[in-house]
């Protein structure tokens, strides 16, 4: 039975040209995290594997940095980076947990962070 929950940074906004940290946290389970995949809509951004460490997709290497922790840092943001991001936790023995973050990249200098929320 899957008892865990994923807490994410929720809906967030950031300035064009700036950076943002995407963070997820798995709680309420003793399952072992074997791998975390980060996806942007239908593109694989990065993978953090418990044994192999980080793999950043080559097409994103210039703008994506691993961490902190199991999170992901997006740099040199553009308006095209606006959209949904997913953290996919592969665990044993529970299976897969998915968290969603919506990022809005703003042209203006006013960018506020949204509230944190949980996805069961």
């Amino acid at each position: 039975m899957m008892t865990g929950t994923i807490e994410t940074t929720g809906n967030i906004s950031a300035e064009k040209g700036g950076s943002i940290i995407l963070q997820c946290h798995l709680s309420s389970t003793t399952a072992q995290v074997t791998q975390v995949n980060w996806e942007q809509q239908d593109q694989l951004l990065a993978i953090c594997n418990a044994d192999l460490g980080w793999h950043i997709s080559p097409s994103f290497k210039d703008r994506v940095a691993p961490g902190p922790g199991l999170g992901l840092t997006l740099q040199s943001l553009t308006v095209n980076d606006t959209g949904e991001y997913f953290c996919i936790y592969h665990t044993y023995p529970d299976g897969t947990y998915t968290g969603r973050i919506f990022l809005e990249v703003l042209e203006s200098s006013v960018a506020e962070h949204g509230a944190r929320f949980q996805i069961p």
Epitope: Q43, N49, H90
Partner: antibody, heavy 118, light 107 residues
């Protein structure tokens, strides 16, 4: 240099058993998921089974579930496939393949031929 | 299970031609799509992983694109050593499944 070397193939009668081995070298075997993929003569590729780095998680194709068992010995850098209750349709070249991040198969062995026939 | 459909099943082309092979998944697989090349009597070789990432050591004339359900492998200028069979494979979920293959033959 990454190398995968399969062995253990041969001719076996229907209902019989065989154990395939895959000796790995040139990388940290214990860090990688490993897979068996087969190819019947003149046909395409079919995934058979996979095993995570720690051996705690295995997965099988429906066509072999309950008959085949994938295992590994990280101290010997070796992957195994125990094949029981073999059928004619199991006749194929069996490849072992390394699966980094459980997402692609980047190195393959040369394959070992299993023929199931009376 | 996720079905992978490749087209065409075979094609004839000449050295220098631009060749395009397509692969369609029966459901969305994000970018969890890999391409392999296989020559007779040899093991498959990884060309492209995660839909568009070129495997180390593979010539840049090979490229991959697509996401969701529709994917493409392109060989920009076919070379004599490229005559082979090409397979797509999804790794979105188990069982891992392969396309039926595309045989690229000399015209």
């Amino acid at each position: 240099e990454v190398q995968l070397l399969e062995s253990g193939g041969g001719l076996v009668q229907p209902g019989g058993s065989l154990r395939l081995s895959c000796a790995a070298s040139g990388f940290t075997f214990s860090s990688y998921s490993m897979n068996w993929v087969r190819q019947a003569p003149g046909k395409g590729l079919e995934w058979v089974a996979s095993i995570k780095s720690s051996s705690s998680y295995t997965s099988y194709a429906d066509s072999v579930k309950g008959r085949f068992t994938i295992s590994r010995d990280n101290s010997k850098n070796t992957l195994y496939l125990q094949m029981n209750s073999l059928r004619a349709e199991d006749t194929a070249v069996y490849y072992c393949a390394r699966g980094p991040y459980d997402t692609w198969l980047d190195y393959w062995g040369q394959g070992t031929l299993v023929t199931v026939s009376s | 299970d996720i079905q992978m459909t490749q087209s065409p099943s075979s094609l004839s082309a000449s050295v220098g031609d631009r060749v395009t092979i397509t692969c369609r998944a029966s459901q969305s697989i994000s970018s969890y799509l890999n391409w392999y090349q296989q020559k007779p009597g040899k093991a498959p070789k990884l060309l492209i992983y995660a839909a568009s990432s070129l495997q180390s050591g593979v010539p840049s004339r090979f490229s991959g694109s697509g996401s969701g359900t529709d994917f493409t492998l392109t060989i920009s200028s076919l070379q004599p050593e490229d005559f082979a069979t090409y397979y797509c494979q999804q790794s979105y979920s188990t069982p891992l499944t392969f396309g039926g293959g595309t045989k690229v033959e000399i015209k």
